[in-house]
């Protein structure tokens, strides 16, 4: 169960969707992507404190064990729960073509 949407660390500190503007050069894509020339990358950034947006029981267990054994068990990670597709116009051996990538942009986030 996804629970705990209140961030105890303060506003903006916990796992959430953020948008980062990146050029093709930033991404290392300039040699094979023609458009878009700039990407508004939505990604999951932030801490995963106890029970915050826990994706499932495993994440809850991970949180508990991390408190007990921080050197052995890492804290849950902030990752996409789902994705938005995006089309890229790319160079190929046979010319320019379209390719849709289903897992390029994060749609929402959780801790796992």
């Amino acid at each position: 169960a996804r629970n705990g949407d209140h961030c105890p660390l303060g506003p903006g500190a916990c796992c959430a969707l953020h948008t980062v503007r990146a050029s093709l050069e930033d991404l290392g894509w300039a040699d094979w992507v023609l458009s878009p020339r700039e990407v508004q990358v939505t990604m999951c950034i932030g801490a995963c404190p106890s029970q915050f947006r826990a994706a499932n029981m495993h994440a809850q267990i991970k949180t508990s064990l991390h408190r007990l054994k921080p050197d052995t068990v890492p804290a849950p990670c902030c990752v996409p729960a789902s994705y938005n597709p995006m089309v890229l116009i790319q160079k190929t051996d046979t010319g320019v073509s379209l390719q849709t990538y289903d897992d390029l942009l994060a749609k929402d986030c959780h801790c796992i």
Epitope: S35, N84, M86, V87, L98
Partner: antibody, heavy 117, light 106 residues
Framework: QVTLKESGPGILQPSQTLSLTCSFS??????????VGWIRQPSGKGLEWLAN???????YYNSALKSRLTLSKDTSNNQVFLKISSVDTADTATYFC??????????WGQGTLVTIS | QIVLTQSPAIMSASLGEEITLTCSAS?????MHWYQQKSGTSPKVLIY???NLASGVPSRFSGSGSGTFYSLTISSVEAEDAADYYC?????????FGGGTKLEIK
Amino acid sequence: QVTLKESGPGILQPSQTLSLTCSFSGFSLNTHGMGVGWIRQPSGKGLEWLANIWWNDDKYYNSALKSRLTLSKDTSNNQVFLKISSVDTADTATYFCAQVAWDWFAYWGQGTLVTIS
Amino acid sequence: QIVLTQSPAIMSASLGEEITLTCSASSSVRYMHWYQQKSGTSPKVLIYSTSNLASGVPSRFSGSGSGTFYSLTISSVEAEDAADYYCHQWSSYPWTFGGGTKLEIK
């Protein structure tokens, strides 16, 4: 495989509203960077861009026609609609819809001929 | 709006001849697309962003240019190249097309 097909009334009288539908398959308007554009071509003449509608529901219109154009979409049914109000004989043309990927009319429909008479 | 002027309006070429079609923009644009439209059919893209050949387009087609002047070259014209050719800019709205060049084969 991407396909698009335009449908319209065929013949219309001056001052009426022209309603066009673009039905498409092979792509989704939920995809970032994807849109559908409308272009028209009077018989024997060149191409004129009319409007684009994008995945995020942004709409852009040809400024010369903007007051007469209305764009909408039904993403779940893969359809885009264009209405042109107060038509006259100058609107007689073949109307194309096309898949737009960022800045590229990548795939076009076969076109539908609309005659204002 | 950016006006695109294509020249010549009509061009007649012999098989195997190299020809160049030009497109002049009223204001500077970053890139230009080129579309081909054969009689009774929908347009299809030939050149994407000034110089990139679209998938499946024969290598005899090429594009170049910058600023306000762009060109499309066919290195060795074939009978199937008889068509109308349009340049297209999207640097600013409204997107515009050139008036077209009709290529006839002698």
